[in-house]
Interface confidence: low
């Protein structure tokens, strides 16, 4: 098979030798009967470059051909070549170079006595010769010609057609349709590549992604896909992935955590506007944000507690002496005194020391403005020292501490995390700097919490963030941390980087994985 870009085709159609004579006017010998002259005719064809004056001599630069005997004297030639398998009509001259658009053609009709002797050198055998030169453009149409020399006529036609996959004026443009990794196209009339639907680019190797797929952050391996580059997500790969653990934040670029209004911290998890978001202060108290998710409440008179949730009972413990009854007023109280007593808290008595009013060894002294007062010994109280003091009754110990009455004093046994005489000092659990890797410590009650920097987690920020934390492995796969990445150990029947692909069922037998196919398939 000669490689070529096109072919010159010559179709011999009809030859007429009216008298059966040679070119030298001699009779063709060898007739078996009348007519006496019978020219057994074959042809020599020579195709060469354009010559202003055509020379029949070699070389036939574009090719030459010698036909078998095609007929006697006058005959027509069918397309295809007829009975003789050694001859095909049209005669084809393949070209391995660009068709120049011009040619010279020599056709000699020759006579032979024997079908086996097709020598063309003997001039005595020549019946007629045509020598012509022509311009010819590439095309399917045949150019028809008739050569007459008086005694003979030769009717023939010719054309130059491109080989399959060759196009253009000189058949110099090569285009073979394909639909594989190297291109997805058919060929246009001039040999230009016409991309199949879904493909683009000079060689139609670039798939056209899902319409709307972000050109920068998405890509595709086949038409209509939209696969996201690292850090992007969504159907069109136009949503950035926030920093892992980002709570009340957004991103413009991957791994950002830009806090929404009112939020702060690395993960935007610290409420900077706790007062507005949560309204923690009760009973008309004033709330003040103190940052990092904390606040303070300024209580209105008559209220107490961290959120001013407790109404203060000014009658507790009872301020009224000598059996006076107490009435709670807003931010105040009033005492109703029993007979014989008076004063704001019924502290004044109509009695005097002469009446011996002081009990339990209390020392009595008369007051200049009337009445008396008792100075009680240790362990007793009351206007008349009538009450044995229960030092724990006033609940002097804070934060759940246990109060121990020592007779003339008390002792507070603090719960874990508190200290001080009344257990009202919160022990600073951050003092030992428990947060590793630059974490920020926040003190609690017998506790602390750490706000970790990016890349760390755990109670003490000592654990690097697990790349498996966000469950990247699908279909029951096991995720393993692998230093600079994670690796999914797929369940049987699944494959792909994240075990997201259902593998085709294999016939039973040993599990041999085709390494090349499998890996290239994942690319």
């Amino acid at each position: 098979q000669v490689w070529s870009s096109g072919v010159f085709e010559l179709k011999l159609q009809e030859f007429v030798n009216k008298k059966g004579l040679l070119g030298n006017r001699n009779c063709c010998r060898g007739g078996a009967g009348p007519p006496p002259c019978a020219c057994r005719t074959f042809f020599r064809v020579c195709l060469k470059h354009y010559q202003a004056s055509v020379s029949p001599e070699p070389p036939c630069t574009y090719g030459s051909a010698v036909t078998p005997v095609l007929g006697v004297d006058s005959f027509s030639l069918p397309d295809g070549g007829g009975a003789d398998s050694a001859f095909s009509n049209p005669i084809r001259f393949p070209f391995g170079f660009t068709w120049p658009g011009t040619f010279s053609l020599i056709i000699e009709a020759l006579h032979t006595d024997s079908p086996d002797d097709l020598a063309t050198e003997n001039p005595e055998r020549l019946i007629s010769r045509l020598a012509t030169q022509r311009h010819l453009t590439v095309g399917e149409e045949w150019s028809q010609d008739l050569h007459s020399s008086g005694r003979t006529d030769l009717k023939y036609s010719y054309r130059f057609v491109c080989d399959e996959h060759y196009y253009g004026e000189g058949c110099s443009v090569f285009c073979r349709p394909r639909d594989d990794a190297f291109g997805h196209f058919t060929c246009g009339e001039r040999g230009e590549k016409v991309c199949n639907p879904g493909w683009k680019g000079p060689y139609c190797t670039e798939p056209i992604c899902l319409p709307g797929c972000d050109e920068q952050h998405g890509f595709c391996d086949k038409p209509g896909e939209c696969k996201c580059r690292v850090g992007w997500q969504g159907r069109y790969c136009d949503e950035c992935i926030r920093y892992p653990g980002c709570l009340h934040g957004t991103c413009q670029q991957p791994w950002q955590c830009n806090c929404q209004e009112g939020w702060g911290g690395l993960f935007c998890n610290q409420d900077l506007n706790y007062c507005t978001h949560h309204k923690p202060c009760k009973n008309g108290a004033t709330c003040t944000n103190t940052g990092q998710g904390s606040y303070t409440c300024s209580c209105r008179p008559g209220y107490t507690g961290a959120t001013c949730e407790l109404g203060i009972d000014e009658c507790d413990p009872s301020p009224c002496k000598n059996g006076g009854s107490c009435t709670d007023l807003e931010n105040s109280y009033s005492c109703t005194c029993p007979p014989g007593f008076y004063g704001k808290i019924c502290e004044l008595s109509a009695m005097t020391c002469a009446d011996g009013p002081c009990f339990n060894g209390g020392r009595c002294s008369d007051s200049p403005d009337g009445g008396y007062s008792c100075r009680c010994p240790v362990g007793y109280s009351g206007f008349n020292c009538e009450k044995k003091i229960d030092y724990c009754s006033s609940s002097p110990c804070s934060n759940g501490a246990k109060c121990v009455d020592l007779g003339d004093a008390y002792l507070c046994r603090c719960q874990a995390g508190f200290s001080g005489r009344h257990c009202d000092d919160n022990v600073d659990d951050c003092a030992s700097s428990p947060c590793a890797n630059g974490g920020t410590c926040r003190d609690g009650v017998n506790d602390f919490s750490c706000t970790c920097p990016p890349g760390y987690t755990g109670r003490n920020c000592s654990a690097p963030v697990s790349r498996c934390e966000h469950a990247p492995c699908h279909n029951g796969a096991t995720c393993h941390e692998r230093g600079h990445r994670y690796v999914c150990e797929c369940a049987r029947g699944y494959g792909g980087p994240n075990c997201q692909f259902l593998l085709p069922e294999l016939p039973p037998g040993p599990a041999v994985v085709d390494l090349t196919e499998k890996l290239e398939g994942q690319g």
Epitope: H480, H484, E489, P497, K518
Partner: antibody
């Protein structure tokens, strides 16, 4: 067919640095990890570190931490390994190797190796 | 430096079977199924023969097989052939990095 082609042999003086390249062709470069493995004359294999070009994050063996830098250029499908503060015991053949992902996890394609000789 | 322990050498006659062991710890061979075996002929780059304990890449003879028990992995070559003569290295992942065995030289006698 995947191919990893490494740069040529190098002769270096102690204390200097060497940078070896590894160009990949015939596969998807970014999706796979590229590791560097060395082999001293007559000795066994030693993993130095690796990188997934897609993430640009490198991981190094503790022994080489601070002395080796592994980088990758996605646009040219090339990985690089730079080893600094060279000493005579760094004389070895340095291989780059592609690691099949997830369900494969082995070095399935290797470069031809680059001999680095450290000598004064 | 060598984290996994392999015998320095093993030998066998053609047609015989041999087994090369690779002993690690609970933090590499014992934990992960990332045990790989590589064959290396002199002057050549290594070639993976078994990956993930017991899987054989396409193109590798079924005479090669792998297994694991506890902290020890094994490579078995049955029906030994002359071309099997080479160095064999086991490798595993140990949470942060790849570790290799010291290598085993396989000699095919005769």
């Amino acid at each position: 067919q995947v191919q990893l082609v490494q740069s040529g042999a190098e002769v270096k003086k102690p204390g200097s640095s060497v940078k070896v390249s590894c160009k990949a062709s015939g596969g998807t470069f970014s999706s796979y990890a590229i590791s560097w493995v060395r082999q001293a004359p007559g000795q066994g294999l030693e993993w130095m570190g690796g990188i997934i070009p897609q993430f640009g994050i490198a991981n190094y063996a503790q022994k080489f931490q601070g002395r080796v830098t592994i980088t990758a250029d996605e646009s040219t499908s090339t990985a690089y390994m730079e080893l600094s503060s060279l000493r005579s015991e760094d004389t070895a053949v340095y291989y780059c190797a592609r690691e099949g992902y997830s369900d494969y996890s082995a070095f399935d394609y290797w470069g031809q190796g680059t001999l680095v000789t450290v000598s004064s | 430096d060598i984290a996994l322990t392999q015998p320095a050498s093993v030998s066998g006659s053609p047609g015989q079977s041999i087994t090369i062991s690779c002993t690690g710890t609970s933090s590499d061979v014992g934990t992960y199924n990332y045990v790989n075996w590589y064959q290396q002929h002199p002057g050549k780059a290594p070639k993976v023969m078994i990956y993930r304990v017991s899987n054989r890449p396409s193109g590798v003879s079924n005479r090669f097989s792998g297994s694991k028990s506890g902290n020890t992995a094994s490579l078995t070559i049955s029906g030994l052939q002359a071309e099997d003569e080479a160095d064999y290295y086991c490798s595993s992942w140990d949470e942060h990095s790849y570790v290799f065995g010291g290598g085993t030289k396989l000699t095919v006698l005769g």
